[in-house]
């Protein structure tokens, strides 16, 4: 008998990221004795929900349902069945639906009440849908990263647990990139916050953190795009629009109302004498990125320094770990290497964009077309929003690192959610209880 | 649906206390503040505060405060205004109604039916 | 607080006709934090326009919101039997108020 695996004791929470363009599941584990350590919570599982995010079931919500029956079910075998009832099941909508309930927060709050009834139909500890804001979803960011990263731990390690950590105790900041919104938090250096809307304060595990941080609804990679087609058919002469952001050879129809269809096109929305127009690629990074930098207002700025469009940002400090999209497009692309600088990045993005699209498709076979077409304007709006938007220079781009996992666990907002939202991140540093971080006894 | 059902009609003395509750169904309890407004017979619509049922924090009209107390029971999803000190023009129908997700804007979507408290010696 | 004030007290009008109904607010208002209810005797009230000018799901389009900053207006633009019912604005800044109402009576 003494020999028989005692039953594991362990919790599980489970954390939804309805974003722009999809919804993904993700199931955390952690032991129930360790709830206030730092460091011990661990994602074991991630489920993509097949289809585009719940903000495009606005006129289908009865769809909804079926949506998320797959990864919802995925959580029910991976979650062993005595642990149901107690797993918390938390959604969070991001940007996508920022955008829906400022077109109509009837429609948002519908699309919510359906996901809500479906949710509750699981045997888990259902806790509620709601869309975060984007001080949430760059501060819980933020966490996640650094709390993974072993920084939040007073025990400084002589080794590293990861390839880009640094043994000091500093922070990371945080540069999330999704469909629709991007955020950057970080904590800087003995700069006062001058704009309290972006100004957050912190107590966790007995230290004290004045963080910075931003969310630039509509400049996420898909509505910047769209942003950028809004601004450029303006001046277009006919219903083609000659686009340097994708590649050689490229051809798309795009719909005059799927357009202007989101708020984010709004500043750029006229009368066009056309329905329709075609995008034609040219495939020219200069100019892409010249396209994208007329996206930035610059001219105006009521603080000491901005980003863009008057936002208040403090000179960047430390390094910083870019994750979501700015990791994936750049692991496709292949340039998420810490050896790899911003001069080589560049040079690369020039020789991605003038591949002609029939070389591109034939090189990328496995890839769908509708996400490998937009790799070259996705890369460029990346350089462009990270040197010119947030004023990275070609030094401090070494100490941006592309993010996709951290010992297993995705980098993004989802597991500081959860951390918070289940107390596990207590205020004051834990009593460590005796031998229970001892190596040796 | 969604479906707001107040407690029946009271009859109270000044000075009394009166308890109205407010069970909620058809969507997710704890989502949704819900708001309290009476109605004086033959008069307009006043409001008396609101509650938040996910973690129970309240804000009362100011001319209210003192008086009035929200409360809720997430396990029956029932909401609770309790007013005190009653006098003769709190005589009123008393209704609760369901107002906006957090984030959202400050209207009030569906309404209970309503319940008469009269405050008489 | 915002005090809202909503004129005329009564307006005396036939099936069939428009109904302009104005709700002044004491102090600027967001658009997105004004409403408009409906309410008749012996009934709760009902939302019917929200953000000064989004109707709410299952109303009629003859029901139109407009106005901002101080003034706004409820249109209804051909008076149904069902429409004559008494009409309050209401505004959100901290607290919610509502105005003293419109009563939209048959002729």
């Known amino acids: 008998t003494q020999n028989k695996a005692l039953p594991e004791n362990v919790k599980y929470g489970i954390v939804l990221d309805a974003g722009s363009s999809h919804t993904s599941l993700y199931i955390y584990k952690w032991p129930a004795e360790k709830e206030n350590d730092t460091g011990v919570v661990h994602q074991v599982e991630e489920c993509r929900v097949k289809g585009p995010g719940i903000s495009k079931f606005v006129q289908k919500v009865d769809e909804i349902g079926i949506y998320l029956t797959d990864c919802m079910e995925r959580a029910r075998e991976v979650i062993p069945r005595s642990q149901h009832q107690e797993t918390p099941v938390y959604l969070g909508a991001t940007a996508g639906m920022r955008l829906l309930r400022m077109e109509s927060e009837e429609l948002a709050d519908r699309v919510l009440d359906v996901v809500e009834t479906s949710l509750s139909n699981y045997p888990f500890d259902f806790q509620g849908a709601r869309i975060i804001t984007g001080q949430e979803e760059g501060a819980y960011g933020w966490i996640t990263i650094n709390y993974l990263l072993g920084k939040f731990s007073q025990k400084t390690r002589w080794f590293s647990i990861v390839p880009y950590e640094t043994n000091n105790q500093e922070t990371f900041g945080a540069l999330d990139l999704g469909g629709a919104s991007t955020q950057v938090t970080f904590v800087p250096q003995n700069q006062t916050i001058e704009s309290p809307d972006n100004a957050l304060q912190f107590r966790l595990y007995g230290k004290d953190y004045n963080v910075y941080t931003h969310s630039f609804l509509c400049y996420g990679k898909d509505q910047a795009l769209w942003q950028k087609l809004a601004k450029d058919i303006q001046v277009a002469s006919n219903e083609i629009l000659r686009d340097p952001c994708f590649h050689p050879g490229y051809k798309k129809v795009v719909n005059v109302s799927d357009l202007y269809k989101t708020p984010c096109t709004k500043r750029f929305e006229m009368t066009l004498p056309f329905q329709q127009f075609e995008i034609q690629g040219i495939g020219n990074y200069q100019q892409c990125h010249q396209s994208i930098l007329e996206l930035f207002n610059t001219s105006y700025c009521p603080y000491s320094q901005c980003a863009f469009n008057g936002i208040f940002l403090p000179p960047l400090q430390g390094d910083f770990g870019a994750f979501s999209a700015f990791y994936f497009v750049m692991k496709f692309l292949n340039l998420t290497s810490e050896k790899v600088s911003q001069e080589k990045v560049t040079e690369m993005m020039k020789k991605f964009c003038a591949q002609p699209w029939e070389e591109i498709k034939t090189s990328y076979a496995g890839v769908k077309e509708k996400y490998l077409s937009e790799y070259c304007f996705s890369g460029t709006y990346i350089l462009s929003l990270l040197l010119q938007g947030y004023h990275f220079t070609a030094d401090s781009w070494e100490h941006i690192h592309f993010i996709g996992k951290i010992q297993g666990s995705d980098a993004g907002w989802t597991l500081g959610y959860m951390l918070n939202l289940t107390n596990m991140i207590p205020a004051e540093q834990p009593l460590s209880t005796p031998l229970s971080h001892s190596t040796y006894v | 649906q969604v479906q707001l059902v107040q407690s029946g009609a009271e009859v109270k003395k000044p000075g009394a206390s009166v308890k109205v509750s407010c069970k909620a169904s058809?969507?997710?309890?704890?989502?949704?503040?819900m708001h309290w407004v009476r109605q004086a017979p033959g008069q307009g619509l006043e409001w008396m505060g609101r509650?938040?049922?996910?973690?129970?924090?309240?804000w009362y009209a100011q001319k209210f405060q003192g008086r009035v107390t929200m409360t809720r029971d997430t396990s029956t999803s029932t909401v609770y205004m309790e007013l005190s000190s009653l006098r003769s023009e709190d005589t009123a129908v008393y209704y609760c109604?369901?107002?906006?997700?957090?984030?959202?804007?400050?209207?009030?979507?569906?309404w209970g039916q309503g319940t008469l408290v009269t405050v008489s010696s | 607080e915002i005090v809202l004030t909503q004129s005329p007290g009564t307006l005396s009008l036939s099936p069939g006709e428009r109904a302009t109904l104005s709700c002044r607010a004491s102090q600027s208002v967001a658009s997105s934090y004004l409403a408009w209810y409906q309410q008749k005797p012996g009934q709760a009230p009902r939302l019917l326009i929200y953000g000064a000018s989004n109707r709410h799901t299952g109303i009629p389009d003859r029901f139109s919101g407009s106005g901002s900053g101080t003034d706004f207006t409820l249109t209804i633009s051909r008076l149904e039997p069902e429409d004559f019912a008494v009409y309050y604005c209401?505004?959100?800044?901290?607290?919610?108020?509502f105005g003293g109402g419109t009563k939209v009576e048959i002729k």
């Open positions: 209401q505004q959100y800044h901290n607290a919610i108020t």
């Open positions: 109604a369901r107002g906006k997700r957090e984030g959202g804007t400050e209207y009030l979507r569906k």
């Open positions: 509650i938040n049922p996910s973690v129970g924090s309240t």
């Open positions: 058809g969507y997710t309890f704890k989502s949704y503040e």
